[in-house]
């Protein structure tokens, strides 16, 4: 009896794993084996496919074959018993085009109200993605184990932190990789669950801001309690995309180690030009807070984007605010040669309820104020360039009383 050649051959490539699956043509014939040959583009001869010779099952793995993943190859299969079937040729394919991105590896670290997610490619030193390793972006789905309501987070890098979670709560998540340059979306990782910790008695420092004074950077933050010590760490921002890099390590700012105030001052030459991440941690000697939210700090912008200077003209029901160029040390105005947008925050002196105005103009009216009432105002500048999305720190607050009624003209 003539053996029929196998049919419906499928090539599955996930990362560097090359798997072939096929259907037997004749289930009634026992003890049949299968063998594959492959042929590279531009070659006439067929070569035995190692790992896929005399296979008794309907699946084989040819991952050990060192192929150029960008080069088209052709496969053929036949069945063998005493005699052999005719060859069945599989449509030619390019491994890279066919390949799927495998599930990434995920490591989670729990805080009380946050989870730190470390993601790395599932296949270390992958040949398939050797040229694209740094282009991976990731997306994840996270849910509270108790509710199952999913939240999706797109376009994250190898390290991501999710804030504003509840203490002592189990969260589950799964992550997949994407290579947007090649229009490839990967396979989800297994589900990872982690329980956030009990609430830390020491909250993380908040509202971290960097400003420039003379030749120094001044880093300030807010903290709930007194008699604390703080430490500040920095990281090159670009490393967030590549924690595999041996430089990926948060480092201490020497002048900000064990400081007893909610600010520290360090020379500008501590940082070369670049974009950095900064974080702060508090300690009372026994306990330690979790790390603060990270702030992005661009030395280029920081040196120039100073808080605006403004004057207030008070009326009974409004303020007119005139914004001028910020002053450097020596009282000389700073020339800022990129367009700015101004954020003005104002509030009644006796209240915490803040209101916000965003304006491109340098003369701004704050309307709907009450007569004979003290209002406070602070302002900051933002760059309008999308690529250079930077902000100054807020100016010091200026408080003024509105005039008595009927003076709005």
């Amino acid at each position: 009896k003539n053996l029929k050649s196998p049919q419906k051959v499928e090539v599955d490539i996930i990362d560097d794993n090359f798997i072939l699956r096929w259907n037997r043509s004749d289930e009634s014939v026992g003890n049949v084996t299968f063998s594959f040959d492959y042929q590279k583009t531009g070659m006439d001869n067929w070569i035995k496919l190692s790992g896929c010779q005399n296979i008794t099952s309907t699946k084989c793995n040819f991952s050990s074959l060192k192929l150029n993943v960008y080069e088209e190859i052709k496969l053929r299969i036949r069945a063998e018993k005493e005699n052999t079937s005719s060859w069945y040729e599989v449509d030619s394919f390019t491994p890279f085009r066919k390949a799927q991105i495998g599930p990434p590896e995920v490591h989670l670290e729990a805080e009380d109200k946050a989870i730190v997610i470390h993601i790395s490619p599932g296949t270390k030193d992958s040949v398939m993605w050797a040229l694209d390793g740094l282009s991976f972006t990731y997306s994840l789905v996270i849910w509270k184990n108790s509710s199952g309501v999913e939240e999706r987070i797109e376009n994250i890098y190898s390290r991501h932190k999710i804030y504003k979670l509840s203490p002592e709560t189990t969260y589950c998540l799964k992550v997949k990789a994407a290579l947007l340059t090649s229009w490839k979306i990967g396979v989800y990782s297994p589900v990872h669950c982690i329980k956030t910790t009990v609430e830390n008695e020491l909250p993380p420092p908040e509202n971290i801001e960097v400003s420039v004074q003379n030749q120094n950077y001044v880093l300030k933050w807010d903290y709930t309690y007194a008699n604390m010590t703080f430490q500040v760490q920095w990281l090159h921002a670009f490393l967030k995309r590549n924690p595999g890099n041996h430089l990926y390590k948060w480092k201490q700012i020497p002048d900000c180690e064990n400081v007893k105030t909610t600010q520290c001052v360090f020379p500008q030459n501590v940082f070369q030009k670049g974009i950095y991440l900064l974080r702060v941690q508090a300690s009372d000697g026994n306990n330690t807070s979790f790390w603060s939210e990270e702030i992005k700090f661009d030395t280029e912008i920081q040196a120039f984007l100073l808080p605006p200077v403004f004057n207030i003209r008070s009326l009974s029901d409004s303020f007119h605010i005139y914004i001028g160029a910020p002053k450097q040390s020596g009282n000389t105005p700073v020339i800022q040669d990129y367009p700015l947008i101004y954020e003005i925050i104002f509030w009644e002196n006796t209240s915490n309820a803040e209101r916000k105005i965003i304006e491109k103009k340098t003369d701004v009216t704050v309307p709907n104020l009450k007569p004979l009432t003290v209002y406070c105002v602070k302002a900051r500048a933002h760059t309008m360039d999308e690529k250079l999305n930077k902000s100054s720190v807020f100016s010091d607050a200026v408080c003024e009383k509105t005039k008595p009624g009927n003076t709005s003209k």
Epitope: K195, K249, F290
Partner: antibody
Framework: QVQLQQPGAELVKPGAPVKLSCKAS????????MNWVRQRPGRGLEWIGK????????HFNQKFRDKATLTVDKSSTTAYIQLSSLTSEDSAVYYC????????????????WGQGTSVTVSS | DILMTQSSSSFSVSLGDRVTITCKSS??????LAWFQQKPGNAPRLLIS???TLESGFPSRFSGSGSGKDYTLSITSLQIEDVSTYYC?????????FGSGTKLEVK
């Protein structure tokens, strides 16, 4: 697979120093903290300190700051602990143990351990 | 330094028993707790990390629980190969500190 290889035993005279080695393989040596732990006969475990093999940053248990020096040789993926001015109190098994990834925000558990080097201080 | 206190230094147990070993820290350690199993003449072996995550290679009869300052290692049905000394260790604050160990002995 991850392996940490340590020599079995060292006999040292009182007052002399000793340098113990820990040869790491099966992982990227510079990506993980390397820790050292002491266990005296019939006693519990004491953490000595840890070193970042990529830049040799060290953290010590204050108790061992004057006793131990931690170093690495990246080319041979080997970590070392040098113990100075040994006394009979320093007789113990010294373990190296891999810690968390250096890129982690917080410390992690010691997941792989060497078999330990037994140091005997005797004249 | 954070002090780690293990409930008892030794336990006399029967095979098949449910065993519970407790570990208390002097400060909150936010689940940064590991359990190690050590057999005579061998290095400690990481059994549980993050207070609850069982390391691969260990059977599911082992489990870890707890939070804040109080943590527990449980063995549902003790087998002969589980007879060892168990240590807890905190890795929240440096210096990392270990409990004094709990030795399981068969009755």
């Amino acid at each position: 697979q991850v392996q940490l290889q340590q020599p079995g035993a060292e006999l040292v005279k009182p007052g002399a120093p000793v340098k113990l080695s820990c040869k790491a393989s099966g992982y990227t040596f510079t990506s993980y903290w390397m820790n050292w732990v002491r266990q005296r006969p019939g006693r519990g475990l004491e953490w000595i300190g840890k070193i970042d093999p990529s830049d040799s940053e060290t953290h010590f248990n204050q108790k061992f700051r004057d006793k131990a020096t931690l170093t690495v040789d990246k080319s041979s993926t080997t970590a070392y602990i040098q113990l100075s001015s040994l006394t009979s109190e320093d007789s113990a098994v010294y373990y190296c143990a891999r810690g968390g990834r250096i890129s982690f925000d917080y410390d992690a558990a010691l997941d792989y351990w060497g078999q330990g080097t037994s140091v005997t201080v005797s004249s | 330094d954070i002090l780690m206190t293990q409930s008892s230094s030794s336990f006399s147990v029967s095979l098949g028993d449910r065993v519970t070993i407790t570990c208390k820290s002097s400060e909150v350690i936010y689940n940064r707790l590991a359990w190690f199993q050590q057999k005579p003449g061998n290095a400690p072996r990481l059994l549980i990390s993050g207070a609850t995550t069982l390391e691969s290679g260990f059977p599911s009869r082992f489990s870890g629980s707890g939070s804040g300052k109080d943590y527990t290692l449980s063995i549902t049905s003790l087998q002969i190969e589980d007879v060892s000394t168990y240590y807890c260790q905190q890795y929240w604050n440096k210096p990392f500190t270990f409990g004094s160990g709990t030795k399981l002995e068969v009755k």
